[in-house]
Amino acid sequence: APVRSLNCTLRDSQQKSLVMSGPYELKALHLQGQDMEQQVVFSMSFVQGEESNDKIPVALGLKEKNLYLSCVLKDDKPTLQLESVDPKNYPKKKMEKRFVFNKIEINNKLEFESAQFPNWYISTSQAENMPVFLGGTKGGQDITDFTMQFVSS
């Protein structure tokens, strides 16, 4: 990989962990004990973003998998997906905008705003075992705050 990256896991503000749900979807649920090993480990890469931006642009890949979170329009709605990439070419210093998230830290919590769709955030539902998605509201029912746990490489 040609860019700095670190391995981490993410939990939402309700302490739900993120796990794979099928080959191209993440879901959020509470895990305990040995089940914690199911949670997805991300490789967070530090990439170039907008010059004037005061947010930290990152790409979120799944560790040792050629899958990245990306934001695309589906049925005219910004949508979060896991996209398969060529591992020989990713991550790279100038990631396509759909792969870039602005990491925003507020009161020790993290938000991940889509660079492609400003004011749309990686979100989880209050309910258990539901897909991780791209949400267009903050401070409502859906959860947009996360904490990051570091995993040694």
């Epitope: 040609p2 670190l6 010059e51 004037s52 005061d54 930290i56 070419n89």
Partner: antibody, heavy 127, light 106 residues
């Protein structure tokens, strides 16, 4: 003034240990990753390892040539980073530098992917 | 492991343009930096993120990076620019340096 100052170098016998310090001033020390480098006499620059800032867990990475022998740590309350060198070899003889690195790209002004402040170096001789 | 290759030496007359190259496999996909080091001194960052110049570095220093080659260009070279120049890139979380180029201003 933003600066880094290395200390702790000296003459040491092969197989022994030495701890170098890198003290920062004039900036928020904990916000930066810190690298250690070395330069053998008349030779080029060689990266030794780095430690991430507190926002990224203070985790470390090392060059293959020192992995298992050298350990980097930091005490942000004192604005000091350390390089603990064990099982020293004659080939570890060099001037050792620390520098700071912005490990993320927040804007065009933060020197992301560049090491903008270097210390003056401290000499380690293993003989 | 990843390697960066620089010419050992480059000579230039005062006022002329000096170009120092750095080659590595798909280097253009990585961020390249350049450091200047004068005898007995610590390195100084002169170019970062391929093309950007830190504050305090003269405009005569510029950088480019594409394909397998990064280039440091010094236009209107001055005697004070005589130094060793090192290219540097990241290979994953490892920092890699070129062997250095001694720039002589004739």
């Amino acid at each position: 003034e933003v600066q880094l100052v290395e200390s702790g170098g000296g003459l040491v016998k092969p197989g022994r240990s030495l701890r170098l310090s890198c003290t920062g001033s004039g900036f928020t020390f904990g916000d930066y990753a810190l690298n250690w480098f070395r330069q053998a006499p008349g030779m080029g620059l060689e990266w030794v390892g780095f430690i991430r800032g507190k926002a990224y867990g203070g985790t470390t990475e090392y060059a293959a040539s020192v992995k298992g022998r050298f350990t980097i740590s930091r005490d942000d309350s004192k604005s000091i980073a350390y390089l603990q060198m064990n099982s020293l070899k004659t080939e570890d003889t060099a001037v050792y530098y620390c520098n700071r690195e912005v490990e993320y790209c927040r804007s065009s002004e933060n020197y992301c992917y560049g090491m903008d402040v270097w210390g003056q170096g401290t000499t380690v001789t293993v003989s | 492991s990843y390697e960066l290759t620089q010419p050992p030496s480059v000579s230039v007359s005062p006022g002329q343009t000096a170009s120092i190259t750095c080659s590595g496999d798909k280097l253009g996909d990585k961020f390249a930096c350049w450091y200047q080091q004068k005898p007995g001194q610590s390195p100084v960052l002169v170019i970062y993120q391929d093309t950007k110049r830190p504050s305090g570095i003269p405009e005569r220093f510029s950088g480019s990076n594409s394909g397998n080659t990064a280039t440091l260009t010094i236009s209107g070279t001055q005697a004070m620019d005589e130094a060793d120049y090192y290219c540097q890139a990241w290979d994953s979380n490892t920092v890699v340096f070129g062997g250095g180029t001694k720039l002589t201003v004739l």
